[in-house]
């Protein structure tokens, strides 16, 4: 009893073609069939009397075949026989192309043969490999072969039986004198204990066969010296099984909560300082000259759109300057040289004269705005939502969808700082990155609008007929200095037309 072993080493099919010359599609996925039979002077078709074996697909076109004897014995190929080795043989090796995974003959293309070789000769039992190379017009196969005795068989023809064993009760061969000689990887008096993979952890690993390292629960790695972290652990490690010790900047049971948004995402722009303020939350402290949630906006005095009536704003070192369109003048282009006679109101706006025809005001229809009703209302164009809030048009109105941590109609309130209503006298609270700010109503000032100040009584333009208005700071009242031809506390009466009193 013995084994004919065939070691395929290299197959060359540079053009990737079948024996017919037809190119393989998609490349020659090559497997081999081997037929071993009794010696024939001319090797001819017929039964493979000594055995047959097939390989899986071993490569495409040209490839080397690696030795895989330790991993299951695919190469060398094994052709066992149960008789006294006769010392002669015939061998047929066929290379076939399999386009798919099914290697049965009927699943192959009709011209699947890549090459076939046939050799015959003498071969004695022994450990030495005979190297051979066969070349056809299109292919070359390099291989080696030998005959060795089966376990427990010895002699020139593998006909002498000896009780060596390789099972649960021992793993040894018979020496010429009958003593046990342990097979590689085994130890002990009867060669029953496997020698595990070198370095396999003594406590966390074990083996049931040589060069193996099987891990106990909670351990992994080639040598079973790496713990398995808690299932789902994202940014963490373990030192004992099932732990999840978080890496720096991460938290939570599975270390999947980002506690260091600043470092991981660098959200602050323009050299701003980033401060973590909770899971996936941060605050940017802007450098002078920048604003916005991420300090992404450059401050400009024109940002508040101070120029009215379509005036264009130009930034200057000491402030700004309004360039007024024709028909307007003043610091903010707030004065008009037009009157209703000039039909200044667009989009169906109706004109109302003011100051006895010296000025006018446009009453705009719905969906239009501007001094002359020249702008279509998009209540979100002015970006009214603060702190990164999202402006949403809702028909005739608008609303702001606030980022977490902000509230108020315009997301102007930081939940934490403005929640206690710190601004006195109806002041509006604004939550800033480093605290809050109060915008005070007329007549009040101070950090919290706690200081009462005088009111500019002239702000409402109470004087008629181009009279000059002066504010009396001591009484918060106004005085009108009438031009020639007008009298009255507001210069509302022309001279010569006395007021008509009701009594």
């Amino acid at each position: 009893s013995g084994v004919f072993q065939l070691q395929l080493q290299e197959f060359i099919n540079e053009r990737g073609v079948l024996a017919s010359g037809r190119p393989c599609e998609p490349g020659c996925r090559t497997f081999f069939r081997v037929c071993l039979k009794h010696f024939q002077a001319v090797v001819s078709p017929g039964p493979c009397t000594f055995g047959t074996v097939s390989t899986p697909v071993l490569g495409t076109n040209s490839f080397a075949v690696r030795d895989d004897s330790s991993g299951g014995g695919r190469n060398p190929l094994q052709l066992p026989f149960n008789f006294t080795w006769p010392g002669t043989f015939s061998l047929i090796i066929e290379a076939w192309h399999a386009p798919g995974d099914d290697l049965r003959p009927e699943a192959l293309p009709p011209d699947a043969l890549i090459s076939k070789i046939a050799i015959q000769g003498s071969l004695a039992v022994g450990q030495n490999w005979l190297l051979d190379e066969q070349t056809s017009t299109l292919t070359r196969l390099r291989y080696s072969y030998r005959v060795i005795c089966s376990d427990n068989y010895y002699g020139d023809n593998c006909s002498r039986l000896c009780k060596k064993r390789n099972d649960h009760f021992g793993h040894y061969v018979c020496q010429p004198d009958g003593n046990l000689s342990c097979l590689p990887g085994w130890t002990g008096e009867y060669c029953q204990q496997p020698i595990c993979l070198s370095g396999c952890h003594e406590q966390n690993g074990y083996c049931s066969k040589p060069a193996e390292c099987l891990c106990r629960p909670g351990w992994q790695g080639r040598l079973c010296n790496e713990c398995i972290p808690h299932n789902g652990c994202r940014h963490g490690t373990c030192s004992t099984p099932w732990q999840c010790t978080c890496d720096e900047g991460w938290g939570g049971l599975f270390c999947d909560q980002d506690l260091n948004y600043c470092t991981h995402h660098s959200p602050c722009k323009n050299g701003a300082t980033c401060s973590n303020s909770g899971q996936r939350s941060y605050t940017c402290t802007c450098r002078p000259g920048y604003t916005g949630v991420d300090c992404e906006l450059e401050l400009s005095e024109c940002d508040s759109n101070p120029c009215r009536n379509g005036g264009s704003c130009k930034d200057q070192e000491d402030g700004y300057h309004c360039l007024c369109p024709p028909g307007y003048y003043g610091l903010h282009c707030e004065h008009s040289t037009l009157s209703c006679a000039d039909s200044p109101c667009f989009n169906g706006g109706s004109c109302r004269e003011r100051n006895q025809g010296a000025n006018y005001a446009c009453e705009c229809p719905p969906n239009f705005t501007g001094s002359n009703c020249e702008k279509k209302v998009d209540r979100c164009t002015s970006n009214p939502c603060a702190n990164g809030g999202q402006c949403l048009n809702r028909g005739p109105s608008r609303m702001c969808r606030c980022r977490p941590g902000f509230t108020g109609t315009y997301c102007e309130l930081h939940v934490s700082d403005c929640a206690r209503n710190p601004c006195a006298h109806g002041g509006t609270c604004h939550d800033l990155e480093n605290g809050l700010m109060c915008t005070c109503p007329a007549g009040f000032s101070g950090r919290r609008c706690e200081v009462r100040t005088s009111i500019d009584a002239c702000a409402s333009s109470p004087c008629f007929n181009r009279a000059t208005c002066y504010t009396d700071l001591s009484t918060d009242t106004f005085v009108c200095n009438c031009p020639y031809g007008f009298v009255g506390s507001r210069c509302e009466f022309p001279v010569g037309l006395p007021p008509s009193f009701p009594w």
Partner: antibody, heavy 119, light 106 residues
């Protein structure tokens, strides 16, 4: 019983078209490559085309390339040959044959269907 | 393209051995099939892979292939063996058939 039955032959003018069918039974049609082979009157056998079991690969002889198309419908166990731009030299008995995988040859043949191209 | 060359005719007496050859360059590198066709009938596969017989084909049919020549041998030829015989192999464009050999049993 393993059987292949061709149909669709007939007389057609040069430049005309025909579609031949081959109904298979008695074996797992979708597992095998199939072929068409023709034989002109008094002449030898000439391979025309073959197609893989799943229909992904198809080949044809140079003499018919661009004119004849082989196809199959595994759900109907049927092989087809579409013949276009027919010429007088295409006159032949057309056989449908099962191509044995792995260089076994054509192990099952139909009875053949005659195609005559004549004006 | 690849050409398989067969003798147009071979004659043999009943009971004698008939040999039909098929030649091409390096034909021994390929597997050859042989077909028998009787008048008015479809071809029948009689030998595949050089010398293997399908079931139902009599043992008197055998084949071999080496070098540049494949041979179909019919030993103990019978009258019923009279037919056309075609060899077949493959080339880069597809299947290739020999021109055919008419076997006459005298």
């Amino acid at each position: 019983e393993v059987q292949l039955v061709e149909s669709g032959g007939g007389v057609v003018q040069p430049g005309g078209s025909l579609r031949l069918s081959c109904a298979a039974s008695g074996f797992t049609f979708g597992s095998h490559w199939m072929s068409w082979v023709r034989q002109a009157p008094g002449k030898g056998l000439e391979w025309v085309a073959d197609i893989s079991n799943d229909g992904r690969y198809a080949y044809s002889a140079d003499s018919v390339k661009g004119r004849f198309t082989i196809s199959r419908d595994n759900s109907k166990n049927t092989l087809y040959l579409q013949l276009n731009s027919l010429r007088a030299e295409d006159t032949a008995v057309y056989y449908c044959a099962k191509a044995g995988g792995g260089n076994v040859g054509f192990d099952i043949w139909g009875q053949g269907t005659m195609v005559t191209v004549s004006s | 393209s690849y050409e398989l060359t067969q003798p147009p005719s071979v004659s043999v007496s009943p009971g004698q051995t008939a040999s039909i050859t098929c030649s091409a360059d390096n034909l021994g590198n390929q597997y050859v099939s042989w077909y028998q066709q009787k008048p008015g009938q479809s071809p029948v596969l009689v030998i595949y892979q050089d010398g293997m017989r399908p079931s139902g084909i009599p043992e008197r049919f055998s084949g071999s292939n080496s070098g540049n020549t494949a041979t179909l041998t019919i030993s103990g030829t019978q009258a019923m063996d009279e037919a056309d015989y075609y060899c077949q192999a493959w080339d880069s464009s597809g299947a290739v058939f020999g021109g055919g050999t008419k076997l006459t049993v005298l």
